[in-house]
């Protein structure tokens, strides 16, 4: 995934950790926080695998790339990065693997240059609808985010608070229409069973969408029509059985698209005929020669591109009088 990277060479480590009072005087703007490494030349701060329980208050103003990975943050409160003056340069923020289970409304406010945010590998049981928009207004100020990486943020089953995880994530993506400029969205490995139908239509700038390693069974109600800039669509390792005509036509109509469909349990019966015909003609599916049938048993491991219409039959539905118990 596209986590913030750094060419940092000379990192200065800070003094031993001292917890600071909430109302403490902000230190000089360029000192390095406790338990972090800083490179002003690379505009990078790394506070990695240090078991931090909160975001350091004394981040240097020059920071463009901030790594807060492998910590124990638990909760990201409103204004977690709000500083006066603001951290105006911060463009890439990586919070992956920091045991976050709650991200509150306005957690990323006052990061006016934030382009790339990675929250992957955090069990987000409670993601506020206003985590990215910062405001409960129907239309918020546009977020500067261009890349949002949310791979493997699904919490354990017993922590899901009896609500749709898909719905919670989508609510945060759509609130206030703040993410209209989002170009890359990664949602891999989240056990998604479905994709709410309105989500893609409201993210018109998307170039890259990664939905791999989920549990998507169907795309019937998902529209790709508005995603005219979409360049890559990753649907590998889902539970897709077939793509229907409407979906095929929409994908074919996207001018720059590359679709990845490996490792889905394709059902090679009469409903697959249109998809097979389309696969033989289309250039948009990458590695299409690797797609194989999973069902029915007699078709297992057959290559989709090698099938013809005679191979794709459906067992006749018996009239009730002939059905056996």
């Amino acid at each position: 995934s596209s986590s913030p990277t750094s060419s940092a060479s000379s990192f200065s480590s800070s003094a031993p950790f001292l917890a600071s009072a909430v109302s403490a005087q902000p230190p000089l703007p360029d000192q390095c926080p406790a338990l972090c490494e800083c490179s002003e030349a690379a505009r990078t701060v790394k506070c990695v695998n240090r078991n931090l329980t909160e975001v350091p208050t004394d981040l240097p103003a020059y920071v463009r790339n901030l790594f807060l990975t492998g910590n124990q943050l638990a909760v990201l409160p409103a204004g977690a990065f709000a500083r006066r003056p603001p951290l105006a340069e911060l463009a890439a923020l990586n919070l992956s693997g920091s045991r976050l289970d709650e991200v509150r409304a306005g957690a990323f406010e006052h990061l006016p240059s934030l382009r790339q945010l990675d929250l992957s590998h955090n069990p987000l049981a409670d993601l506020s609808p206003f985590a990215f928009s910062g405001s409960n207004a129907s239309v918020s100020a546009p977020s500067p985010l261009v890349e949002l990486i949310l791979n493997h943020i699904v919490p354990p089953e017993d922590e899901r608070q009896n609500r749709s995880f898909e719905g919670m994530v989508v609510a945060a993506l759509l609130a206030g229409r703040a993410l209209q400029g989002l170009r890359r969205l990664e949602l891999a490995s989240n056990h998604f069973l479905y994709l709410p139908r309105d989500v893609l239509a409201q993210l018109p700038s998307l170039r890259h969408l990664d939905l791999s390693n989920n549990s998507l069974v169907s795309l019937t109600y998902v529209s790709f029509r508005n995603l005219t800039h979409l360049e890559s669509l990753h649907l590998e390792d889902n539970a897709l059985k077939v793509l229907h005509n409407g979906t095929l036509a929409e994908l074919q109509g996207l001018p720059h698209i590359r679709v990845f469909l490996d490792n889905n349990p394709w059902v090679c019966d009469c409903h697959m005929a249109d998809m097979v015909t389309w696969l033989k003609e289309t250039e948009v599916v990458q590695g299409k020669d690797r797609l194989t049938c999973a069902y029915p048993e007699k078709m297992r491991n057959r290559v989709l591109l090698e099938l013809n219409s005679a191979d794709l039959d459906c067992d006749p539905i018996l009239p009730p009088s002939l059905q056996t118990s």
Epitope: V22, S23, P26, P77, A82, L87
Partner: antibody, heavy 127, light 112 residues
Framework: QVQLQQPGAELVKPGASVKMSCKAS?????SYWITWVKQRPGQGLEW???????????NYNEKFKSKATLTVDTSSSTAYMQLSSLTSEDSAVYNC????????????????????WGQGTSVTVSS | DVLMTQTPLSLPVSLGDQASISCRSS???????????LEWYLQKPGQSPKLLIY???NRFSGVPDRFSGSGSGTDFTLKISRVEAEDLGVYYC?????????FGSGTKLEIK
């Protein structure tokens, strides 16, 4: 429209404390700092400190650290400043102001300032 | 603390004249992210201050274009090209780059 409402005046005795309010309306209270400024009669302005209502985190001018305590009540969109151990030197007008992004330009989202001010609370310390 | 020195303390002008106010900081107020948080505020008699200029030279919304700000590093200037009666009051510069944030001592613009 954005408004910051402050009570007009407070009369307090030397050695006592006073807690003044600044009630915000017309915007998302938790998304902007509240700054407090002191102005003594015929003198200039002094920054006391500020508080971010979203997190409750406050910053203080070292000079006022043992004098002022800043708090917020997000449920009523109200910021408070308590001044303790009052003396005649604390007689002044105290203004609250909103600090945050100025949505006046798309080209520079890094523009922040104190864009709205309360009318001020006049504190008189007298026995 | 960063000391903000304003000159003059008092500026008598005739309506229609140009006025110029200087503000000098005791150290650079360029923040380490490259921004200079230098603002100008006007306080009219009996009122609270109002924002005129932010980040050295940007006019706040609703501020007439006869107001302009300039400068860099430690030296800053506010100019009013043609003074009008509603411009009278005390002008303060303010640095929001280094804690504690500090105001200038103020310049009183008055009619000659």
């Amino acid at each position: 429209q954005v408004q910051l409402q402050q009570p007009g005046a407070e009369l307090v005795k030397p050695g006592a404390s006073v807690k003044m309010s600044c009630k915000a309306s017309g915007y998302t209270f938790t998304s902007y700092w509240i700054t407090w400024v002191k102005q003594r009669p015929g003198q200039g302005l002094e920054w006391i400190g500020d508080i971010y209502p979203g997190s409750g985190r406050a910053n203080y001018n070292e000079k006022f650290k043992s004098k002022a305590t800043l708090t917020v009540d997000t449920s009523s969109s109200t910021a408070y400043m308590q001044l303790s151990s009052l003396t005649s030197e604390d007689s002044a007008v105290y203004n609250c102001a909103r600090y945050g992004p100025l949505f006046t330009t798309v080209v520079d989202p890094n523009s922040y300032a104190m864009d709205y001010w309360g009318q001020g609370t006049s504190v008189t310390v007298s026995s | 603390d960063v000391l903000m020195t304003q000159t003059p303390l008092s500026l008598p002008v005739s309506l229609g004249d140009q006025a110029s106010i200087s503000c000098r900081s005791s150290q650079s107020i360029v923040y380490s992210n490259g921004n200079t948080y230098l603002e100008w505020y006007l306080q009219k008699p009996g009122q609270s201050p109002k924002l005129l200029i932010y980040k050295v030279s940007n006019r706040f919304s609703g501020v007439p274009d006869r107001f302009s700000g300039s400068g860099s590093g430690t030296d800053f200037t506010l100019k009013i090209s043609r003074v009008e009666a509603e411009d009278l009051g005390v002008y303060y510069c303010f640095q929001g780059s280094h804690v504690p944030f500090t105001f200038g001592s103020g310049t009183k613009l008055e009619i000659k």
